[in-house]
């Protein structure tokens, strides 16, 4: 059928609570595409009726809630103007009773459910809650060994639990809980997180990686509109800023009056081991003064540039 197959690493999930998966693969979902979800190679698409327990919500598949029998391989088919991609997602559902210590740990936990705090540092845990816009999440509560976390060393900030002056006693089993509301119904989301402590300073000095641009030139005609993405991978809990600069000045400040060149709104896709961030720069109209100038994408300490250049003349036209 001419679709390119892409395989998601297995997702292991907890029964009896909501779960959502967004059909996104950055190289192909950035343009005009249609997305359709299927289960186990069925020819019948997943329902789009919001009252259905399992339904497609825009590019997401949403389980309200997930049940043990929902395990299986789901496919989302992404159709673009001149391409088709089929993403296979293997969902394994298990029963987990968070406070029952007689039951073993989670099987093959992904990094979202295994997190590290750094001894003696101020650090944080993240509650990974990935749901479509139709789902409204209430405030998050945090638990350690099934007791709600209290104390001045702990601060809840949006989806994070800030832990100051991490000690060895902070290792253990945590859970974050939120109430999700969808179409007037409420559901509990409870994510377990196994926390270990390390003495190594933060993430081995992990540096954001700029995937694109790659310090290269782009041929572009005078007067055209141009949009260039800066794609950056970084750790899940990074605090790096990402932006476009020219002449060491933020493009929005540099072109404050004309607004001819603007930085776009940053978006990100959460992957298992990292986040992929995208922030674009838009040239509403390329002018002569733009050629030869390095437009720099900054991500923390990492930088990469593009340089616009006039296309070589096409003598065949004469």
């Amino acid at each position: 059928d001419g679709c390119k197959d892409i395989f998601m690493k297995n997702e292991i999930l907890s029964a009896s609570q909501p779960f959502a998966f967004n059909c996104t693969f950055p190289p192909i979902t950035s343009g005009e595409v249609s997305v359709t979800w299927y289960k186990n190679s069925s020819k019948i698409p997943v329902s789009k009726i919001i009252q259905s327990r399992i339904h497609q919500d825009e590019t997401w598949i949403l389980f309200l809630p997930m049940e043990w029998g929902d395990s299986g391989v789901y496919q989302c088919v992404i159709k673009g103007r001149d391409s088709c991609h089929r993403i296979h997602v293997n969902l394994t559902v298990f029963e987990k009773h968070w406070c029952d210590t007689s039951i073993g740990g989670l099987p093959n936990l992904s990094d979202e459910y295994k997190q590290i705090l750094h001894l003696g540092k101020d650090d944080s845990l993240t509650c990974h809650l990935h749901f479509p816009k139709s789902c409204v999440l209430g405030p998050i509560k945090w638990y350690k060994d099934c007791n709600e976390i209290k104390g001045e060393r702990f601060t809840v900030l949006e989806t994070r639990l800030l832990v100051s002056n991490v000690s060895a006693e902070d290792r253990g089993n945590y859970a974050c809980q939120a109430i999700l509301t969808h179409s007037g119904k409420q559901y509990e989301v409870l994510n377990g997180i196994t926390v270990s402590i390390t003495e190594r300073a933060g993430y081995g000095g992990s540096v954001p990686k700029i995937i694109y641009p790659k310090n290269h030139s782009i041929e572009v005609q005078l007067g055209t509109t141009l949009i260039v993405d800066c794609n950056v991978t970084d750790t899940k809990d990074n605090t790096n800023l990402r932006c476009w600069r020219v002449n060491n000045t933020l493009v929005d400040d540099y072109y404050d009056e004309s607004k001819r060149i603007r930085e776009g709104v940053e978006t990100h896709v959460s992957f298992r081991e990292h986040n992929l961030y995208t922030v674009n720069i838009t040239f509403l109209e390329v002018k002569m003064e733009d050629y030869g100038l390095p437009f720099m994408c900054h991500a923390g300490v990492s930088t990469a540039y593009i340089i616009l250049q006039l296309p070589a003349p096409d003598f065949r036209a004469y």
């Epitope: 001419g2 892409i6 001149d82 298992r272």
Partner: antibody, heavy 125, light 107 residues
């Protein structure tokens, strides 16, 4: 530094089998597909197939089904290709090549960003 | 299988010149196309992936363009080390297939 180190040249008789190896280092072996590619003398490149080192799943070019068998040993970070029923047509240089993969939550076919140095196989009586 | 037709099969050029090769896919492959350089007696080396993206460490004089079924590869200001064979490859669907190659020779 990513490296793919292939086994040495092979001189084999028609009808025999040979097992080539490709040892990976400098990255997590199970994160990327390993491909095998054939190049006959003075010719273009032919994709034989690929193996997913994390679970051993394989995908073959139909032209090489029954001819090539792809396996891995995760503990040795090594991929293998066994070639069976060799004829003079199989005389070529065989390369292993790692699939480039930015999005580490996914596995998919993509360009090969690192290649082994190649193993020359000569089939002659 | 998707056929990849590369042209020209060979080309002569001088140092400092620019050259362009083309690659035609027998069906649409989006931008799932790679370009490789192979010097005599050596392994192929990835230059371009995703039709237009420069691989790590590859000089910016190499560039790729195109999507769907028609693709181009350009080298500007040829250097001595650029004289080699070049292959396109579709990675849209298995079996992955290569073009027949373009041999770039010094004039």
């Amino acid at each position: 530094e990513v490296q793919l180190q292939q086994s040495g040249p092979e001189l084999v008789k028609p009808g025999a089998s040979v097992k080539l190896s490709c040892k990976a280092s400098g990255y997590t072996f199970t994160d990327n597909y390993m491909n095998w590619v054939r190049q006959s003398h003075g010719k273009s490149l032919e994709w034989i197939g690929r193996v997913n080192p994390s679970n051993g799943d394989t995908k073959y070019n139909q032209n090489f089904k029954g001819k090539a068998t792809l396996t891995v040993d995760k503990s040795l970070s090594t991929a293998y290709m066994q070639l069976n029923g060799l004829t003079s047509e199989d005389s070529a240089v065989y390369y292993c090549g790692r699939t480039k993969n930015f999005y580490s939550s996914y596995s998919y076919d993509d360009a090969m960003d690192y290649w082994g140095q190649g193993t020359s196989v000569t089939v002659s009586s | 299988d998707i056929q990849m037709t590369q042209s020209p099969a060979s080309q002569s050029a001088s140092l400092g010149e620019s050259v362009t090769f083309t690659c035609l896919a027998s069906q649409t492959i989006g931008t799932w196309l790679a370009w490789y350089q192979q010097r005599p007696g050596k392994s192929p080396q990835l230059l371009i992936y995703a039709a237009t993206s420069l691989a790590d460490g590859v000089p910016s004089r190499f560039s790729g363009s195109g999507s769907g079924t028609q693709f181009s590869f350009n080298i500007r200001s040829l250097q001595a080390e650029d004289f080699a064979s070049y292959y396109c490859q579709q990675v849209y669907t298995t079996p992955l297939t290569f073009g027949g190659g373009t041999k770039l020779e010094i004039k």
